[in-house]
Interface confidence: low
């Protein structure tokens, strides 16, 4: 598998992985102790034709060309959990791997 | 995890799983032996706000806002493979289970 | 009521740009496509493109895609149409309409609420 | 690009009349079509929609039928305000495609 990495100063318009700092406290998000922020990244760009197509799927779809059918997107493709800390719903203080939280990698699906 | 789905008839615009019948013969797919068509389904509407939002991390870009991210997609979140029976390009017939060529669900990611 | 009021209208040289801009009010901006449509003097009615001002993505007409670039601001509740490399064809009054979806499937949607139009004039 | 032919261009009529407009696709498009109606230095109007469904507020004199490739904008009796440019779109794929318009005219 493989996935594009941009930041802001990238000249490419196809499905790339940006930096994205995501931060609680700007959110006003105070039931998270830690951490404050983390680096989450996103995705974006375009996906033409066949760029970045993780599944055989997403060309078949294409092909077929089904009404109301958008085309593929830019979307994580592979992503992974970081660790947190915060108050659950009863106050009380919970450590844990909460999933999906970091883009590893972006394509077209 | 949860996903919508939806027919033509349906009165459904938001990220839905719609039906979808691939006919490979009719691609001129003539290197695949079997099946000649298969049951590939696909994902098609709107993503609004928190609907069918897969990870916490679409919510938190979307918070974020940065420039470029063109909001959560509906795509889909889950798929599965089927057997196939086709040439490789050797002209060797092969079996094999071919990954994420059907899709089960679909979420806004 | 739902409106969506536009710009004034615009006299431009050839070969400059024109952004033409559509302010929504009435509704919920965000929730629904906005598609613009152009009408040369006389002639029929062509389909440009649309935007999602959820998300900023766009579908435009093939013959534009070169020149156009549809934006929305979410703040204002305004979409803006802008045209680039203008000609003397260009010349034609520019429509947004909203699009409205009634539900009965993706392509289940019809135009309910129209701008009053903004007349551009190409001319050297 | 999907073409719609409508016909005809141009159509003069009575008060009182019923006439029909007829929109012709390049190919199939289900019921994705609307119907227009558009006045001298006015913006567009839907009238109908998904080939057969009344907009909310026009009169039950409108009526569209039609599926596939073949649809037809109908007004069963013309009064003096019907007189006007009507546009039948496809709305089945992008880019969406207007026919080319008919000109209703008082006879």
């Known amino acids: 598998d493989f996935g594009l990495d941009c930041d802001e100063h990238s000249t490419e318009s196809r499905c790339c992985r940006y930096p994205l700092t995501v931060d609680f406290e700007a959110f006003g998000w105070d039931w998270i102790i830690a951490p404050k922020r983390y680096k989450a990244n996103y995705c974006s760009g375009e996906c033409e034709f066949v760029f970045l197509q993780k599944y055989p799927h997403t060309h078949l779809v294409h092909q077929a060309n089904p009404r109301g059918s958008a085309g593929p997107c830019c979307t994580p493709t592979k992503m992974s959990p970081i660790n947190m800390l915060y108050f659950n719903g009863k106050e009380q203080i919970i450590y844990g791997k909460i999933p999906a939280m970091v883009v590893d990698r972006c394509g077209c699906s | 995890d949860f996903g919508l789905d939806c027919d033509e008839h349906s009165t459904e615009s938001r990220c839905c799983r719609y039906p979808l019948t691939v006919d490979f013969e009719a691609f001129g797919w003539d290197w695949i032996i079997a099946p000649k068509r298969y049951k590939a389904n696909y994902c098609s509407g709107e993503c609004e706000f928190v609907f069918l939002q897969k990870y916490p991390h679409t919510h938190l870009v979307h918070q974020a806002n940065p420039r470029g991210s063109a909001g959560p997609c509906c795509t889909p979140t889950k798929m599965s493979p089927i057997n196939m029976l086709y040439f490789n390009g050797k002209e060797q017939i092969i079996y094999g289970k071919i990954p994420a060529m059907v899709v089960d669900r679909c979420g806004c990611s | 009521q739902v409106q969506l009021v536009q710009s004034g209208a615009e006299v431009k040289k050839p070969g400059a740009s024109v952004k033409v801009s559509c302010k929504a009010s009435?509704?919920?901006?965000?929730?629904?496509?906005m598609h613009w449509v152009r009408q040369a003097p006389g002639q029929g009615l062509e389909w440009m493109g649309n935007?999602?001002?959820?998300?900023?993505?766009?579908n435009y007409n093939q013959r534009f895609k070169a020149r156009v670039t549809m934006t929305t601001d979410t703040s204002t509740s305004t979409a803006y149409m802008e045209l680039r490399s203008l000609r003397s064809d260009d010349t034609a009054v520019y429509y947004c309409?909203?699009?409205?979806?009634?539900?009965?499937?993706?392509?289940?949607?019809?135009?309910?609420?129209w701008g009053q139009g903004t007349l551009v004039t190409v001319s050297s | 690009d999907i073409q719609m032919t409508q016909s005809p261009s141009s159509l003069s009529a009575s008060v009182g009349d019923r006439v029909t407009i007829t929109c012709k696709a390049s190919?199939?498009?289900?019921?994705?079509l609307s119907w227009f109606q558009q006045k001298p230095g006015k913006a567009p109007k839907s009238l109908i929609y998904?080939?057969?469904r009344l907009v909310d507020g026009v009169p039950s004199k409108f009526s569209g039928s039609g599926s596939g490739t073949d649809f037809t904008l109908t007004i069963s009796s013309l009064q003096p305000e019907d007189f006007a440019t009507y546009y039948c779109?496809?709305?089945?794929?992008?880019?969406?495609?207007f026919g080319a318009g008919t000109k209703l005219e008082i006879k």
């Open positions: 309409a909203r699009r409205y979806y009634y539900g009965t499937g993706p392509a289940d949607w019809y135009f309910d609420v």
């Open positions: 009435g509704y919920s901006f965000t929730g629904y496509f």
């Open positions: 935007i999602y001002p959820y998300n900023g993505v766009s």
């Open positions: 190919q199939d498009i289900n019921s994705y």
């Open positions: 998904r080939a057969n």
């Open positions: 779109l496809q709305c089945d794929e992008f880019p969406l495609t």
